[in-house]
Interface confidence: medium
């Protein structure tokens, strides 16, 4: 098994067991030792080994560290002399006692955690052991503590979440690979509360969004919508412009590894019969001789419940992409769970997914990140083989993706039905543009123009920012009674005609409100078209209207250069 | 930022005690950890002890083992190292350090003081 340096593994043909010492070794004779041969190594031998791979700076195949760490039976000594990454797969009970157990986890905090997937044995008894050790009791964690857990704190479960969030949000912010259920719920939580490091969701800026990064995808709906709507759109477009968060490009199988596994034969008695936990003892080039394609084909739902590291799924993919050149069935597909990730968008290109329990099953991997390349291609795939965007659809995307509909172009919304437009929540509609929502408001007003007036307004309200002017007048009608924050987000050119008495009407309660909006738009441009007295009568201050004796002339261009109405005066 | 600062560095008799203090001020929550070092005309620095806030589990370099007792006052933000049967090769200047981490590493240490002198004459 070839490393990250890039050397090649030389056959040991049984070296190990008889050099006139093992450090003598060559980078290479050590880098493609076989478990099969360490198994027959004394425990000195072993150690010996372990030793001379961590002063060649050696980096080896996590089915090798496996194996080296089940054969050093006894606590090592020197543990600073060993590969920094075996001490991971290491029992922290043999080193007990608060001498012994400092040692080793000053070192272990230092390893690249992430060799084990999150669900890995290995990897789920370091966490408790490292807090015993460092002496945490309860779940208050200072910044300290912390630091000292290295990569063991993305592993912190939610209660630690919850009573430290202040000195751990920032540290899952950096966490690679996806947090789990508890700690997303968690996370949402203590956002939400708006307390240290971020403040209320109402008080943050760009660099606060910056600042969240990794945790952004955990943010419910009910927080994004308390962010200012502003900040949102200035962070998306310089989100969208910075290729810093651009996600790389899953791995697909390099050309290396192709030649590294074909034609090896399946040593005997290791045939798979099933696929169940005995192959994550499986190097890649058994799991590619020893596992039918057929098999794992059929078996695709077991494939989750197994911990396989990733270079494994990588070898389950590349059966199944020899299996499917054309594209996987969508039986398959459905059950590919987490090997989704692995998926390019070429991959995906190839598949017809007509089932919706498909794609929920697929969004459901995704579930708590942002929209990848990915999913992306999988919904286009899906909604084009669908023909249009229909109310089921609808429904489950936007439950996986809030801001699904507004992510579509103008052009791609008109291919949506009046009939699917009942699915839309408010919050589905956060992120839209004047131009999306001028295409959604006239589906609306047909989708609900059989409710009554009260009923109706609720439904409509959330599309209102496509609404015109007309429209607008019919509703000041009605005692709707409109919300501020509703009327800001109407068309500007939709709300210059209307008259105080009509806007007074519209707003009821609310009108109010103008006063503290009286500098933005569009109240500010429709204060302007306001003669001053009829603004007077509404007893709120409102200054800026015209003077009376005046005349408006609707000159309309010399408007459109100055953005105020032409005056003649007395 | 931590501010530390070292004190009770003086000559003392071969076999005498000596007690060194260091005060720690600023913000004291992001570290975890305190270690005192010392560094001999011409040596390197050397490890001593190291004390951590969690538990206040102490842990002592072999050639202090059994005369060296790291303790901490949490009341007035001080560490001390009482050092007993005094050699003259524990001459050297004393420095106290903090920071973050299990405290093997000297990279575990981002904060530290000045020193003081220990001086044991023979």
């Known amino acids: 098994l070839a490393g990250e340096t890039g050397q090649e593994a030389a056959p040991l043909d049984g070296v190990l067991a008889n050099p006139p010492n093992i450090s003598s070794l060559s980078p290479r004779q050590l880098l493609g030792f076989p478990c099969a041969e360490v198994s027959g190594l004394s425990t000195e031998r072993v150690r010996e080994l372990a030793v001379a791979l961590a002063q060649k700076n050696v980096k080896l195949s996590t089915e090798q560290l496996r194996c080296l760490a089940h054969r050093l039976s006894e606590p090592p000594e020197d543990l600073d002399a060993l590969p920094l990454d075996l001490l991971l797969f290491l029992n922290p009970d043999a080193f007990s006692g608060p001498q012994a157990c400092t040692r080793f986890f000053s070192r272990i905090t230092k390893a690249n955690v992430d060799l084990l997937p999150r669900g890995a044995p290995e990897r789920q008894r370091l966490l408790p052991a490292a807090l015993a050790c460092w002496g945490v009791r309860g779940s208050l964690l200072s910044e300290a503590d912390v630091r000292a857990l290295g990569g063991l704190a993305c592993d912190l479960p939610g209660r630690f979440v919850a009573e430290s969030a202040e000195v751990l949000l920032p540290r899952l912010v950096s966490c690679p690979g996806p947090l789990d259920q508890d700690q997303q719920e968690a996370a949402r939580a203590a956002l939400q509360g708006g307390g240290p490091p971020y403040g209320p969701p109402s008080t943050w800026s760009v660099s606060t969004m910056d600042a969240l990064r990794g945790l952004l995808p955990v943010l419910g709906q009910p927080i994004i919508r308390s962010i200012p709507q502003g900040i949102v759109a200035a962070w998306r477009q310089r989100s969208s412009r910075d290729p810093s968060w651009r996600q790389p490009e899953r791995t697909i199988l390099r050309p290396r590894f192709r030649r590294e596994v074909e034609k090896t034969a399946c040593p005997s008695g290791k045939k798979a019969r099933e696929i169940d936990e005995s192959l994550i003892f499986y190097k890649k080039w058994e799991l590619e001789a020893c596992v039918d394609a057929a098999l794992l084909a059929t078996q695709m739902d077991r494939v989750n419940a197994i911990p396989f590291t990733y270079e494994q799924l990588d070898v389950l993919k590349h059966k199944l992409d020899e299996l499917y050149p054309q594209g996987y069935p969508e039986s398959v597909i459905q059950h590919l769970g987490y090997l989704f990730l692995k998926m390019s968008p070429e991959d995906i290109r190839k598949w017809n997914v007509t089932s919706l329990e498909t794609l929920k099953a697929l969004l459901e991997v995704n579930k708590g990140h942002e929209m990848s390349p990915q999913v992306a291609t999988l919904i286009d795939r899906f909604v084009k083989g669908r023909g249009q965007l229909d109310k089921d659809t609808l429904d489950t995307l936007t439950a996986f993706y809030p801001g699904y509909l507004c992510s579509l172009s103008p052009e791609e919304l008109s291919s949506v039905p009046p009939s699917s437009i009942w699915a839309v929540r408010p919050q589905d509609l956060d992120t839209c543009d004047p131009r999306q929502l001028d295409v959604l408001y006239p589906k609306a007003r047909l989708a609900f123009q059989n409710m009554n007036g009260s009923e109706y307004f609720v439904k409509i309200q959330s599309f209102l920012g496509g609404a015109p002017t007309e429209d607008l007048k019919a509703l000041s009608q009605q005692n709707v009674s409109m919300d501020l924050a509703t009327f800001m987000k109407l068309r500007t050119d939709a709300v210059l005609p209307l008259t105080v008495a009509e806007v007074q009407k519209l707003l009821g309660p609310h009108v109010e409100g103008l006063k503290a909006e009286e500098r933005h738009r569009p109240v500010r441009d429709w204060i302007l078209r306001q003669r001053q007295d009829d603004l007077d009568t509404l007893g709120l201050g409102l200054q800026g209207g015209i003077p009376n004796g005046y005349l408006v002339l609707d000159l309309s261009m010399q408007e459109a250069l100055s953005g105020t109405p032409c005056l003649l005066g007395p | 930022q931590v501010h530390l600062v070292e004190a009770g560095g003086g000559l003392v008799q071969a076999g005498g005690s000596l007690r060194v203090s260091c005060a720690i001020s600023?913000?004291?929550?992001?570290?975890?950890?305190l270690g005192w070092f010392r560094r001999a005309p011409g040596k390197e620095r050397e490890f001593v002890a190291l004390?951590?806030?969690?538990?206040?589990?102490?842990w002592y370099e072999d050639s202090a083992k059994g005369r060296f007792t790291i303790s901490r006052d949490n009341a007035k933000n001080t560490v001390y190292l009482q050092m007993n049967s005094l050699k003259p090769e524990d001459t050297a200047v004393y420095y106290c350090?903090?920071?973050?981490?299990?405290?093997?590493?000297?990279?575990?240490?981002?904060?530290w003081g000045q020193g003081t002198q220990v001086t044991v004459s023979g």
């Open positions: 004390i951590r806030w969690s538990n206040n589990y102490a």
């Open positions: 600023g913000r004291t929550d992001s570290t975890g950890i």
């Open positions: 350090a903090a920071g973050t981490g299990w405290g093997f590493s000297i990279s575990d240490y981002n904060y």
